[in-house]
């Protein structure tokens, strides 16, 4: 049973490792809310649909977010 039933964060550990954008199926950015007081970034990988929590403060992850948003802006008309 969780210590606090009001806190509903998802990430138990966070990864600081770089992620290859090509290996990404989906990238979710969950803003801080009343349920979880921190931003959570969850990457769904193409390989077996593995989900991995990323560290929003990591330089590598910030670069990944930039690369993904750049890619998206290229695609949008």
């Amino acid at each position: 049973v969780p210590l606090s039933r009001t806190v509903r964060c998802t990430c138990i550990s966070i990864s600081n490792q770089p992620v290859n954008p090509r290996s990404l199926e989906k990238l979710e950015i969950i803003p801080a809310s009343q349920f979880c007081p921190r931003v959570e970034i969850i990457a769904t990988m193409k390989k077996k649909g593995e989900k991995r929590c990323l560290n929003p403060e990591s330089k590598a992850i910030k670069n990944l977010l930039k690369a993904v948003s750049k890619e998206r802006s290229k695609r949008s008309p």
Partner: antibody, heavy 121, light 108 residues
Framework: QVQLVESGGGVVQPGRSLRLSCAAS????????MHWVRQAPGKGLEWVAV?????SIKYYADSVKGISRDNSKNTLYLQMNSLRAEDTAVYYC?????????????????WGQGTTVTVSS | EIVLTQSPGTLSLSPGERATLSCRAS???????LAWYQQKPGQAPRLLIY???SRATGIPGRFSGSGSGTDFTLTISRLEPEDFAVYYC?????????FGQGTKLEIK
Amino acid sequence: QVQLVESGGGVVQPGRSLRLSCAASGFTFSSYGMHWVRQAPGKGLEWVAVIWFEGSIKYYADSVKGISRDNSKNTLYLQMNSLRAEDTAVYYCAREGAGSSLYYYYGMDVWGQGTTVTVSS
Amino acid sequence: EIVLTQSPGTLSLSPGERATLSCRASQSVSSGHLAWYQQKPGQAPRLLIYGASSRATGIPGRFSGSGSGTDFTLTISRLEPEDFAVYYCQQYGSSPYTFGQGTKLEIK
């Protein structure tokens, strides 16, 4: 290298308290969830507790209710009160895999060598 | 509480043979929440498989995991002398995050 070292075990009388520590080195401790797992003599593994990377969320088995961490000291703790003979075991701390979440679990990928707690009068 | 039942309790095989270890859950467990560990006498456990079928870093290819729902399997394709140990499955679907009682793999 990546290492977890438990300490604080020993012989203690029933009803007394004990605090176990687990010192982490070789990795960014504050990014990882951490567990305590115990093993009674000649028995199997029993999961005890987990604390999430920044310490805000804790889950327990029925046996113990005192996991905590100090990220500034790279140390995990287990506070055990009102000890009973059934708490006699080797206590291991273990690291949760990088990026683990409620959606997907990467397993306990690094373990300490354990500290022995013997509860006896 | 999800109860994991491992079978057989003891498995006696020779090096070079194939080992099949079973783990059955009392209720459905997502495959992303099932892991396998190996433990040798006097040592800490070692992670073998996570996500039911993904090998942990440094684990040889002879180890493989499969299954979903309530039935999971660890297979060792060709037993090496160092593989004789106790194997545990563990679920992370709901707290408490229980282990199975273990399967002892011994040399025949």
